[in-house]
């Protein structure tokens, strides 16, 4: 749990930080795990200690291996270890799978993709970005901040991008490079605030006293496959569950249909031999997704029996 | 029934971070909304985000991105509105509401200034 | 983002009166649209949802009606308890857009 894999390029500069954190005031002490080796503290050292930051200024292939820190306070010490691995650079333009971060995805609306680990460093804009070893150029590209920005996103922009940025220490400067893939998504579908469709706001269903009743809560939540999307019944605001009457129970799942292209779920509340006090609940048919919840309220009234007399 | 309870009144330096909390009850949290709106002193309503705890998903309205953090606690049934690098301009009464986006129930407001 | 234009801003009428209040917005967001009132140092309180439908324990004095871009909230008879602003809220996208506010004046 408190070991971290890092990685980086021979010649350029690594920072890592501690897996285990603490107050800045803490003492943070760094060890070569193989030797037991005090990591130095002066900035004249190659390779230094600085607080939770380990930094290799540049690093160096030999530099490979597995890092202790300790953090130290008055009451407690923190043991973690930093799996450190620094490989040759490549001649060709391809970047090995183990020198890439985690993958991003964007969409037309959204895609930003962020640069890696600069929050360690002590680097200044503009920060420069290529796509599988391409200078990026053109007025879709926007390099903001610690990200890039990729106006009116194709297919065609999926890849692998890189960035790369100079870290300062003491007047001396280091590039570094990091990469990672970027996926574009298929943004054909969408998803609004759901819309319940049943039953109305403040329906009054009529049901009869020792007969079954059910109650549909149905709802729509935008086109194509819904990732977050859930249509539930509360009784007096608490869940079926937790409400305890076992004559009263919510379907299990949720029914998923497309109505005019809508991604639709319905989900029933049967209740088995309808008693007075069922008239004096409220039920709650909850529709919610990434977006937002709507709730619509039920009553249930007696139904009158039909009068045969003329 | 459903009842929204804000913490108190905050007074804070530019540049400052300030966190208001709404504690909720007479209700099931994890299938509510929770929204928050503020308003200005004189001014009128202004929608700032909101988050589906059952889901843990969280919107924010372009404006206050990446300067507002909002969170839920559910074993307390507590939200949380964080806002950061204040400026005068943040001086208002923060509002949370119960759902999203039909506001239906609402805290009695935090009054938040800012000023140096 | 939707742009809601609430009109008059502000309005000077008497108990028992029939007042009108309107709401535009940028684009149409069918019928979803919301109307709260607010008291001096109060929170706001939903009046009505989905541009026709009564909050429960408001007064059936309280009417809302409209779809598309154009919307209206009437109070059938005013009352001194109604002397407050008024605010439309969309209700169909993110992010939610209130409107600037009507303020209802004892006249």
């Known amino acids: 749990k408190f070991s971290k894999q890092s990685w980086g390029l021979e010649n350029e500069a690594l920072i890592v930080r501690c897996p285990r954190q603490g107050k800045p005031s803490y003492t943070v002490d760094w060890y070569y795990s193989q030797t037991n080796k005090s990591i130095p503290t002066q900035e004249r050292n190659r390779v230094f200690a600085s607080g939770q930051l380990l930094k290799f200024l540049p690093a160096a292939v030999a530099d490979s291996g597995i890092y202790t820190c300790i953090v130290r306070s008055p009451t407690f010490n923190r043991t973690g270890y930093a799996n450190v691995t620094i490989y040759k650079k490549q001649s060709d333009c391809n970047v090995p799978d183990y020198l890439m971060y985690s993958t991003v995805s964007g969409s037309e609306k959204n895609s930003k993709i962020y640069c890696p680990t600069i929050d360690l460093y002590n680097w200044t804009a503009p920060l420069e970005w290529f796509k599988n070893c391409q200078a990026l150029q053109g007025s879709r590209y926007r390099a903001h901040k610690s990200f890039l920005v990729i106006d009116n996103v194709m297919t065609e922009d999926a890849g692998d991008y890189t960035c790369k940025f100079i870290h300062n220490e003491n007047g001396a400067n280091y590039s570094v490079t990091a990469t990672r893939s970027f996926t574009v998504k298929d943004e054909q579908g969408f998803s609004l605030f759901p819309v319940i469709g049943a039953p109305a706001q403040n329906e009054i269903k009529e049901v009869e006293i020792g007969k079954n009743a059910n109650l549909t809560c149905s709802a729509c939540f935008g086109k194509g496959t819904q990732f977050l999307a859930a249509v539930l019944w509360q009784l007096n605001g608490t869940k079926i569950t937790d409400f305890g009457e076992p004559r009263i129970q919510q379907e299990e799942g949720q029914n998923q249909s497309f109505s005019n292209g809508l991604a639709c779920l319905d989900m029933v509340l049967r209740i088995a031999d309808v008693k007075e006090e069922d008239l004096l609940l409220q039920y709650d048919c909850l529709a919610l997704n990434l977006h937002g919840l709507r709730r619509h309220t039920v009553r249930l009234s007696r139904k009158n029996p039909i009068d045969h007399h003329s | 029934q459903v009842q929204l309870v804000q913490s108190g009144a905050e007074v804070k330096k530019p540049g400052s971070s300030v966190k208001v909390s709404c504690k909720a009850s007479?209700?099931?949290?994890?299938?509510?909304?929770i929204s928050w709106v503020r308003q200005a002193p004189g001014q009128g309503l202004e929608w700032m985000g909101g988050?589906?705890?059952?889901?843990?998903?969280?919107n924010y309205a372009q404006k206050f991105q990446g300067r507002v953090t909002i969170t839920a606690d559910e074993s307390t049934s507590t939200a949380y509105m964080e806002l950061s690098s204040l400026r005068s301009e943040d001086t208002a009464v923060y509002y949370c509401?119960?759902?999203?986006?039909?506001?239906?129930?609402w805290g009695q407001g935090t009054l938040v200034t800012v000023s140096s | 983002d939707i742009q809601m234009t609430q009109s008059p801003s502000s309005l000077s009428a008497s108990v028992g009166d029939r007042v009108t209040i309107t709401c535009r917005a940028s684009?149409?967001?069918?019928?979803?649209l919301n109307w709260y009132q607010q008291k001096p140092g109060k929170a706001p309180k939903l009046l009505i949802y989905?541009?026709?439908s009564l909050q429960s324990g408001v007064p059936s004095r309280f009417s809302g009606s409209g779809s598309g871009t154009d919307f209206t909230l009437t109070i059938s008879s005013l009352q001194p308890e109604d002397f407050a602003t008024y605010y439309c809220?969309?209700?169909?996208?993110?992010?939610?857009?209130f409107g600037g506010g009507t303020k209802v004046e004892i006249k």
């Open positions: 007479g209700g099931s949290f994890s299938s509510w909304a």
């Open positions: 509401a119960r759902d999203l986006p039909d506001m239906v129930s």
């Open positions: 988050i589906i705890p059952l889901f843990g998903t969280v």
């Open positions: 809220q969309q209700s169909y996208s993110t992010p939610l857009t």
């Open positions: 684009q149409s967001i069918s019928s979803y």
């Open positions: 989905a541009a026709s």
